[in-house]
């Protein structure tokens, strides 16, 4: 997970949902048992703070050591702080836990800015509003890193949800989730509901709301509204999607779809922006300016960079376009999309807004490694990662943001042709240096 | 080369409005590139923005004078205007218009400026 | 809001001499900050933005430095005609309101 450019994200309470839920779709497919209904107490089992992270408390060792641990979707490593660091309140003491074993190997993990480095163990492992069981996990303990740990984020490590191919040291390294499916009865799936506040949110403010869900094991109804639709994970490493086509305002980028997906698309819960390649950056970004003409917004906004207020409660949210993304269905030739409101993509900023201001920052950013759907999209949506059917749902998230105008939307189907032609196929080569920096 | 020039009265009443305008010559105000804008500086003090319009009509302005305050631009005479009511002897300073160039954050371009001294 | 902090207040300095004036952000404002010289009469005239880049026609002897908090306008050899008040201004958040209070550099 690579922080400075890979940042995490915002969190926090959410606005109601819009108007009544919308009826299920008649031939949804029937779930195995167990799957699908309440899954009361892991509902709300997520805290965060705006642009550091959404974490869920996670116990290790025995006696069990309590720990706030970074969700991460786009990386495959269960690693947790193991020695002092100013900014941990806590960290992992494997010298008090009778069941911690040294696997006698270490791990280095350097990203585009930062690093950290451990040592590989394991130790038993839950997650006390999760599925009531007990694993043996693998952990990395981080003893050394830099630019990793974020000042205040109140997380000690981090959970990668994503696949052994990206694991590291190297892929024969169990990540948590497949131990977590092979020692339990948990189905292989897991949920995300992520509820960007809309507003700052203070340290106090951070600790007592909600920040969301991670349903472990299944499908929690109450998370989201309409149907959920899914799209196919073309590739087990991260959560590699296929985009098809993108829209502002519903106007076609009319690029050719191997752009969106070049060199990948990934759904990653640890990138706080919705990062797009550099040629789909640039005519988003025109197509957004382009929309909210009316006004005229400096170039360092466009950047990421700089922040823009308006008085309290008199931000234009109507100035700014939709944006929707078109995803490849289960179906041949059958497509969906999903759509963000500005009330997503605009990300509000703390410890700079007086009572006076609402400032934001624009959440969406350029890369080198592919479109990244971080908390900008998840915000908007109740995402599955249905890993036993290698697939992703979407569905409007309960707890999104929104006006009284326009709603978040996951809508389909729409005939799209080709589909299988907009996955980019990265060189074997290419692979080793992509994934040592995500930049 | 583009100039800007302010214009209106130098004596207000406590009470009446304040109007200024500024002229744009050697260039369009319609441009897409600026915003333009008010500045002020009581005698002896700092800098205060006002506020800043872009050629479409959009305006952003002070909060601490928005209660006050109204921007205008006219295209057709390449003018922007600023109105300031309900004035008081705390309002009396040199007015300046500006151009917000660079990127749309700096001031690049400013007018002379104009004393406006609210007396009775 | 961020405030930003000019020091000193007046500067006393001989022709030749150079010239550090000081700018402090309450919160980090990035590179977003600019610098402008007020003559006496006079209305102000960019010098340097972006933290560091010379407006046009600003001459060499002019540079600006810093990031996040902490700034510095340097006048390597100060010339009789760089007599004035310099403000610094943050454009972090926009629109760009906030002005420092002024550091006056005077004729010792």
């Known amino acids: 997970t690579q922080h400075g450019i890979r940042l995490p994200l915002r969190s926090g309470l959410g606005g109601a949902p819009l108007g009544l839920r919308l009826p299920r779709e008649t031939d949804e497919e029937p779930e195995e048992p167990g799957r699908r209904g309440s899954f009361v107490e892991m509902v709300d089992n997520l805290r965060g703070k705006s642009g550091q992270g959404y974490y869920v408390e996670m116990t290790v060792g025995s006696p069990p050591q309590t720990l706030n641990i970074l969700v991460d979707t786009g990386s495959s490593n269960f690693a947790v702080g193991a020695a002092p660091h100013p900014f941990l309140h806590r960290y992992y003491q494997r010298q008090l836990s009778s069941t911690y074993r040294d696997l006698r190997k270490g791990v280095y993990v350097p990203y585009t800015q930062g690093k950290w480095e451990g040592e590989l163990g394991t130790d038993l492992v839950s997650i006390p509003h999760g599925p009531n069981v007990t694993v043996r996990a693998n952990i990395a303990a981080i003893t050394e890193s830099d630019k990793f740990f974020i000042n205040g984020s109140n997380w000690e490590g981090i959970l990668g949800l994503a696949y052994a191919e990206i694991a590291r040291p190297d892929d024969s390294l169990e990540p948590f989730f497949d131990s977590l499916v092979k020692q339990t009865h948990v189905p292989n799936l897991f949920s995300l509901q992520l509820c960007g506040a809309g507003f700052p949110l203070n340290q106090s403010e951070v600790l007592a709301s909600v920040g969301g869900s991670m349903i472990i094991g299944g499908i929690d109804h109450s998370l989201y509204t309409g149907s959920l639709w899914y799209t196919p994970i073309r590739r087990e490493w991260y959560y590699e999607v296929i985009i098809v086509r993108v829209e502002i305002n519903g106007q076609d980028l009319k690029m050719d779809c191997k752009e969106y997906n070049y060199d990948k698309s990934i759904v990653d819960s640890g990138t706080t922006n919705l990062r797009l390649p550099k040629k789909v950056f640039e005519a988003a970004v025109k197509s957004i300016k382009a929309a909210s003409s009316t006004e005229k917004f400096p170039d360092g906004f466009w950047l990421g960079e700089q922040l823009v207020c308006w008085q309290a409660g008199t931000t234009p949210w109507n100035i700014f376009p939709v944006i929707s993304l078109y995803l490849m269905g289960e179906v041949t030739n059958q497509s969906f999309r999903i759509t963000i409101l500005p009330q997503q993509y605009l990300r509000p900023v703390e410890d700079v807004a007086t009572s006076q201001d609402d400032c934001y920052k624009f959440a969406i950013s350029q890369s080198s490694t592919g479109t990244v759907m971080g908390a900008v999209i998840m915000e908007g949506f109740y995402v599955v990662f249905d890993r036993a059917r290698k697939r992703i749902g979407f569905a409007v998230s309960a707890c999104h943001v929104h006006d009284e105008f326009r709603t978040a939307a996951v809508e389909g189907p729409f005939v799209t042709l080709d589909m299988e032609d907009c996955g980019y196929n990265i060189p074997q080569t290419d692979e080793s240096t992509l994934m040592t920096g995500r930049a | 080369q583009l100039q800007l020039q302010e214009s209106g009265p130098g004596l207000v009443k406590p009470s009446e409005t304040l109007s200024l305008t500024c002229t744009v010559s050697?260039?369009?105000?319609?441009?897409?590139?600026?915003?333009w804008g008010w500045i002020r500086q009581p005698p002896g003090k700092g800098l205060e923005w006002i506020g800043m319009?872009?050629?479409?009509?959009?305006?952003w302005y002070n909060p601490s004078l928005k209660s006050r305050v109204t921007i205008s631009v006219d295209t057709s005479k390449n003018q922007f205007s600023l109105k300031l009511s309900s004035v008081t002897a705390a309002d009396t300073a040199v007015y300046y218009c500006?151009?917000?160039?660079?990127?749309?954050?700096?001031?690049?371009?400013w007018g002379r400026g104009t004393l406006v001294t609210v007396s009775s | 809001e961020i405030v930003l902090t000019q020091s000193p207040a007046t500067l006393s300095l001989s022709p030749g001499e150079r010239a550090t004036l000081s700018c402090r952000a309450s919160?980090?404002?990035?590179?977003?900050l600019a610098w402008y010289q007020q003559k006496p009469g006079q209305a102000p005239r960019l010098l340097i933005y972006?933290?560091?880049k010379r407006a046009t026609g600003i001459p060499a002897r002019f540079s600006g430095s810093g990031s996040g908090t902490d700034f510095t306008l340097t006048i390597s050899s100060l010339e009789p005609e760089d007599f004035a008040v310099y403000y610094c201004?943050?454009?972090?958040?926009?629109?760009?309101?906030?002005f420092g209070g002024g550091t006056k550099v005077e004729i010792k």
């Open positions: 201004q943050q454009v972090y958040t926009w629109p760009p309101r906030t």
């Open positions: 050697g260039g369009s105000i319609s441009s897409s590139s600026y915003y």
């Open positions: 919160q980090s404002v990035s590179s977003y």
């Open positions: 972006g933290a560091s």
């Open positions: 319009i872009y050629y479409s009509g959009s305006t």
């Open positions: 500006a151009r917000v160039g660079h990127g749309v954050s700096y001031f690049d371009l």
